[in-house]
């Protein structure tokens, strides 16, 4: 006769590992008893367990509640056994040694692996800035048996550098993706993919970049310098910029304190029926958290009595 | 053939303790298995637990918790400690060894020793 296993076993932690070990006899013999035993290198033989024809399932203390026969129905010839709820501890060889009647006795080895699943985490890097160099956008870290592999997946241009640690019966992996931050880059996904034996899918984990920043600011509403006239109604002049975090606008007057019936609202500058008085210089000045820029402009109200036009200037400054 | 020797056995009060010993001489195998079952008067003998060389062991649901079995391979001895005894643990208590033989196995019996509980 001969006996049939399996040379590796591999359960994910936490599952149930079934250790086969099937005795293919000649007709007539008979399976006495199964001993199992963890055979690590380096370490005398522990008993697991042992199948007895006549008196059944034999367990070890240090394996007590956790050794079970397979459900029924069995064959006599089976000496399988079920090793409940794998820890990582549980990693390592096993020994099925069989006694039939009246073959003697067999023996055969199989390693049992236990896969840990990562469970990974994503850090973001410090707040990204436009004009920075090249910065660390985030980190994403994932620990499990074998090293789990890790990759990031995103439109956004980068560079990845990845290092290891090894413990005892796992790895850590830290995959840093760095990047040279650009307003482009505002709202853009940056996901960690983590790839593992163990899982049936792979786990990804996604960041949303966020961009410091703040577009240079100009002045909308004199470009036909014309319309500004006395007598004007509605006219107004709107600040242009962006950013991150959007920006807060506030207007003043250079040369003075703002005409009474100016109205601001927010990036807006409106003005009543223009009169010589509303003339002068305006800034916009917008500013967030990242920084503020300025621009100005030169209103000259037109008196239409007047034949020649004036001229407008357009400063912008940071 | 095996011979087989126990002791330990008495009187003791529901609650109590006691520990019972199986010396085995002989023609020991190495696969042996070694055990002990009880009969109480007027009952089947049924079994209380057994134990491989290895330290593997199988106890009956009755004695769980309470009863536990060891073995010295060296001195191919079995113990059995008892505790929190109850009445209904009152019965004479036998050494079993387990040996191959031809085609199966073979149980070597002791002529037992008897455990009374009682207040």
């Known amino acids: 006769g001969e006996l049939e296993t399996s040379d590796v076993v591999t359960v994910v932690l936490g599952q149930d590992a079934k250790l086969p070990c099937f005795y293919r006899g000649d007709s007539g013999e008979q399976v006495g008893q199964v001993a199992w035993a963890r055979v690590d290198a380096g370490e005398g033989a522990q008993e697991l367990a042992l199948l007895h024809s006549k008196y059944g399932l034999h367990v070890s203390p240090a394996y007590e509640g956790r050794v079970e026969q397979p459900p029924p129905p069995r064959n006599p010839l089976d000496g399988s056994v079920l090793l409940r709820n794998a820890v990582q501890a549980d990693e390592g060889e096993y020994e099925c040694r069989v006694s039939t009647f009246p073959a003697g006795s067999f023996q055969a080895r199989l390693r049992l692996r236990v896969l840990v699943p990562p469970l990974p985490s994503l850090n973001p890097g410090p707040a990204l800035e436009e004009g920075q160099g090249l910065t660390l956008a985030a980190s994403c870290t994932a620990e499990g048996s074998p090293a789990p592999s890790v990759t990031w997946d995103t439109e956004v241009k980068g560079t990845t550098s990845s290092r290891s640690f090894k413990h005892s019966r796992s790895a850590a992996v830290t995959s840093e993706f760095h990047l040279v931050p650009s307003r482009s880059m505002n709202g853009q996904p940056l996901t960690c993919v983590v790839s593992h034996p163990g899982l049936l899918q792979d786990q990804r984990i996604t960041h949303i970049l966020h961009v410091s920043f703040l577009a240079e600011a100009s002045v909308r509403g004199l470009e036909d310098q014309n319309l500004w006239h006395i007598g004007r109604e509605g006219a107004m002049l709107k600040c242009l910029s962006e950013g991150q975090p959007p920006p807060s606008y506030n207007w003043t007057r250079l040369d003075g304190p703002l005409p009474s019936g100016v109205r601001v609202d927010g990036d807006t500058l409106g003005f009543p029926p223009l009169t010589t008085e509303h003339s002068g210089i305006y800034v916009c000045h917008v500013s967030n958290e990242f920084s503020s820029r300025d621009s100005q402009v030169t209103v000259d109200v037109l008196d239409p009595q007047e034949d020649s036009g004036k001229q407008v200037d357009l400063v912008s400054a940071s | 053939e095996v011979q087989l020797v126990e002791s330990g056995g008495g009187l003791v009060q529901p609650g109590g303790s006691l520990r019972l010993s199986c010396a085995a001489s002989?023609?020991?195998?190495?696969?042996?298995?070694m055990g002990w079952h009880r009969q109480a008067p007027g009952k089947q003998r049924e079994l209380v637990a057994t134990?491989?060389?290895?330290?593997?062991?199988n106890y009956a649901d009755s004695v769980k918790g309470r009863f536990t079995i060891s073995r010295d391979n060296g001195k191919n001895t079995v113990y059995l400690q008892m505790n929190s005894l109850r009445a209904e643990d009152t019965a004479a208590y036998y050494c079993?060894?387990?040996?191959?033989?031809?085609?199966?196995?073979?149980?070597?019996w002791g002529q037992g020793t008897q455990v009374t509980v009682s207040s």
């Open positions: 079993v060894d387990v040996e191959p033989s031809g085609m199966g196995w073979r149980d070597y």
């Open positions: 002989g023609s020991i195998s190495s696969i042996n298995l």
């Open positions: 134990i491989t060389r290895g330290g593997s062991t």
